[in-house]
Amino acid sequence: SGTTNTVAAYNLTWKSTNFKTILEWEPKPVNQVYTVQISTKSGDWKSKCFYTTDTECDLTDEIVKDVKQTYLARVFSYPAGNVESTGSAGEPLYENSPEFTPYLETNLGQPTIQSFEQVGTKVNVTVEDERTLVRRNNTFLSLRDVFGKDLIYTLYYWKSSSSGKKTAKTNTNEFLIDVDKGENYCFSVQAVIPSRTVNRKSTDSPVECMGQEKGEFREI
């Protein structure tokens, strides 16, 4: 059963990056408002974003409680404003979202190269360990804290003077690579979760090149 004068939400979509998770839907409301409910498969339906005219709801606080759970959301439509009222007690119209498992599906945010340091013919490249909104013991966890060894980084590097790229991989946040003495190199990294079937890779980080401020060089 539904309430008169309302349109059910549609195109319910999860938008999630590094566990920052927002449910989006359509349409823009006319004489109606929305309330979102979220649940785990075995849990209770918890109301969020009460009676909103927005078409998105930030559900980060809920999903970070257990990122390995599978969540389902639903969006209720209620008539609002100066509309004809029936006094109906029936359950309002609602639409279910697709299921969403944050650990398996959140997009990996674009990584950042924190620093690189050259020591002779070796370069140590460090990837910034981005903070997430996942908490443990009142402390925000980093991406590495959450994913552990499931998360790897791929480093792409090349001589500034050529286009031939080399790659390296690490399951930490550091690379140690061999370079030719006297050559400047450029670097880009990508976060990867090889075990995933969807959203396996992040976009590439901004390119950083030797001879710019990020690096430190020591000839030994």
Epitope: V33, G43, Y51, Y78, A80, V83, E91, P92
Partner: antibody, heavy 118, light 106 residues
Framework: QVQLVQSGAEVKRPGSSVKVSCKAS????????MYWVRQAPGQGLEWIGQ????????NYNENFQGRVTITADKSTSTAYMELSSLRSEDTAVYYC???????????WGQGTLVTVSS | EIVLTQSPALLSLSPGERATLSCSAS?????MYWYQQKPGQAPRLLIQ???NLASGVPARFSGRGSGTDFTLTISSLEPEDFAVYYC?????????FGGGTKVEIK
């Protein structure tokens, strides 16, 4: 049907604490937000705070922050509102109220009169 | 916080008459709720989301308004309608209630 039954009237001394209970029946207790609202004699209504029994998530009115604690016991389907450092201005009827379709204060308990007097 | 001002504070009318109660918000709100309270009883929800009748509420009650100005209308007062009426908003935290309008028998 939804029923919210509150504990009986209380008389308290200034500086002491009071804990009011609200026993719910007729629905799945853990699935709905529970709110607390008070009404001083001859006055309007004031929201105190709320709890989601499913996970214990709670929020409070800043005016009561530090003095109020709202809890829920899923095993007995009972919500509690504890107010400390009582003063005479806290004399009021305290209501528990539950969300419904289209409104957060849809179902109300019968109220508990708390009198703070020396 | 949003302050809701109800007017008049007291409305003296006879059964069968039309009652119009006003609620003015200190800032624009999305929608308004209305409650009825009788002596010794808890408030009872009448209108939600500005104009929707709550379950079991007679059709003689209606709500309208937008922005800062909202009204509750009782088209023809019945003896059981004499009570105190409160408006309430939750567009902004904390939720707030108006001071009430008492509708008494003239």
């Amino acid at each position: 049907q939804v029923q919210l039954v509150q504990s009986g009237a209380e008389v308290k001394r200034p500086g002491s604490s009071v804990k009011v209970s609200c026993k719910a029946s007729g629905y799945t207790f853990s699935s709905y937000w529970m709110y607390w609202v008070r009404q001083a004699p001859g006055q309007g209504l004031e929201w105190i705070g709320q709890i989601y029994p499913g996970d214990g998530d709670s929020n409070y009115n800043e005016n009561f922050q530090g003095r109020v604690t709202i809890t829920a016991d899923k095993s007995t389907s009972t919500a509690y509102m504890e107010l400390s450092s009582l003063r005479s201005e806290d004399t009021a009827v305290y209501y528990c109220t539950r969300e419904g379709y289209g409104n957060r204060f849809a179902y109300w308990g019968q109220g508990t009169l708390v009198t703070v007097s020396s | 916080e949003i302050v809701l001002t109800q007017s008049p504070a007291l409305l003296s009318l006879s059964p069968g008459e039309r009652a119009t109660l006003s609620c003015s918000a200190s800032s624009s709100v999305s929608y308004m709720y209305w409650y009825q309270q009788k002596p010794g009883q808890a408030p009872r929800l009448l209108i939600q989301l500005t104009s929707n009748l709550a379950s079991g509420v007679p059709a003689r009650f209606s709500g309208r308004g937008s922005g800062t100005d909202f009204t509750l209308t009782i088209s023809s007062l019945e003896p059981e309608d004499f009570a105190v009426y409160y408006c309430q908003q939750w567009s902004y935290n904390p939720p707030t209630f108006g001071g009430g309008t008492k509708v008494e028998i003239k």
